[in-house]
Interface confidence: low
């Protein structure tokens, strides 16, 4: 499996899509797991509804949601309020019994929001600071800094 990169904005939501053959994986539940180390186990983060027919219902575990379009063959994972510690290697999985097939390997990278600033001429980018402010968002790439939140340091 090749690894697909998804680059999301800190404090916002990132949507990861995992396409699959809907006939081949018919009747199978899906899961999203985080790879622990290069050759380590994949730790389950969230899985689709226990009843496969209800896989379209969004299930949350903390700030991570999963929903499955079983007819169209697309598993969608939403990482809400993306933070630097969310960066890493993940997998979309198709479950059958105690086994799991990898649908897609995903590398999540967290970028800074170019609109998180007070001076409109400045942008802030990766590598310039370790600190991110928490933000509450519902949609991917859909908002800028809330009034009262502390802006990132500007580009030097």
């Amino acid at each position: 499996h090749n690894t697909t990169v998804f680059q999301g904005v800190a404090g916002q939501s990132l949507q990861v899509s995992c396409p699959y053959d809907s006939m081949k994986h018919w009747g199978r539940r899906k899961a999203w797991c985080r790879q622990l180390g290069e050759k380590g186990p994949c730790q389950r983060v969230v899985s689709t509804h226990n009843l496969w027919l209800l896989s379209f219902l969004r299930r949350w575990n903390g700030s991570t949601a999963i929903t499955d379009d079983t007819l169209g063959g697309t598993l969608t994972i939403t990482l809400r309020n993306l933070q630097p510690h969310d960066a890493g290697l993940y997998q979309c999985q198709s479950l059958h019994g105690s086994e799991a097939d990898t649908l897609r390997k995903v590398l999540v990278e967290v970028l800074a929001d170019p609109l998180d600033h007070r001076d409109a001429g400045d942008l802030w980018f990766p590598g310039e600071s370790e600190s991110f402010e928490d933000a509450h968002v519902e949609h991917s790439i859909s908002r800028s800094l809330l009034e009262g939140e502390i802006p990132f340091p500007p580009t030097s």
């Epitope: 680059q7 904005v9 400045d122 942008l123 802030w124 980018f125 949609h139 991917s140 790439i141 859909s142």
Partner: antibody, heavy 120, light 108 residues
Framework: QVQLVQSGAEVKKPGASVKVSCKAS????????IHWVRQAPGQGLEWMGI????????SYAQKFQGRVTMTRDTSTSTVYMELSSLRSEDTAVYYC?????????????WGQGTMVTVSS | EIVMTQSPGTLSLSPGERATLSCRAS???????LAWYQQKPGQAPRLLIY???SRATGIPDRFSGSGSGTDFTLTISRLEPEDFAVYYC?????????FGGGTKVEIK
């Protein structure tokens, strides 16, 4: 399908302003950043700035600071780029471009471009 | 401002040949903040690669990107007639986003 449709070509005199529009369709307008990039005749690409259509927040390249204004109208899913105090070196094709959700600082869907000619 | 330098300026090759395009940044842009675009005359650019090596949606696998730090490469494994165009790299690590001057791939 997903597309960005820009307004037509403009001819302006030095010192004047130009306002280019970019109408989005085929996707949720407020969920993707829009950037503006220009290209002078026979030259390379130059990034001008970015707007978040959801809140209207903007950030501009320092070079254009004070001369460029990016706005949006969510009711018509349209983004605008206004450049003032035009000079001959502003003659270029101006593109609006959408950022994909996989990587919000690159440009996967582009408008067809608007040619702006600045000439006395 | 990070300056992006592309080489060669022009690459003359025949269909079926392998094309290797180079892009160098004036300072490190890490490993994941570089994109490649293709532009044909009279058309808007088309995103090929982002994150230095991830192909954009619908891009054929004959296009591949590699590199990190300051040196990046776009490789077209076997040139098709439709691949003859100008190619630009772009960094998005630091403000402002900047593009290279472009490499023109022309038919030999």
């Amino acid at each position: 399908q997903v597309q960005l449709v820009q307004s037509g070509a403009e001819v302006k005199k030095p010192g004047a302003s130009v306002k280019v529009s970019c109408k989005a369709s085929g996707y949720t307008f407020t969920s993707y950043y829009i950037h503006w990039v220009r290209q002078a005749p026979g030259q390379g690409l130059e990034w001008m700035g970015i707007i978040n259509p959801s809140g209207g927040s903007t950030s501009y390249a320092q070079k254009f600071q004070g001369r460029v204004t990016m706005t949006r109208d969510t009711s018509t899913s349209t983004v605008y780029m206004e450049l003032s105090s035009l000079r001959s070196e502003d003659t270029a094709v101006y593109y609006c471009a959408r950022a994909p959700q996989e990587s919000p600082y690159v440009f996967d869907i582009w408008g067809q471009g608007t040619m702006v000619t600045v000439s006395s | 401002e990070i300056v992006m330098t592309q080489s060669p300026g022009t690459l003359s090759l025949s269909p079926g040949e392998r094309a290797t395009l180079s892009c160098r940044a004036s300072q490190s842009v890490s490993s994941s903040y570089l994109a490649w675009y293709q532009q044909k005359p009279g058309q808007a650019p088309r995103l090929l690669i982002y994150g230095a090596s991830s192909r954009a949606t619908g891009i054929p696998d004959r296009f591949s990107g590699s590199g990190s730090g300051t040196d990046f490469t776009l490789t077209i494994s076997r040139l098709e007639p439709e691949d003859f165009a100008v190619y630009y790299c772009q960094q998005y690590f630091s403000s402002p986003f900047t593009f290279g001057g472009g490499t023109k791939v022309e038919i030999k």
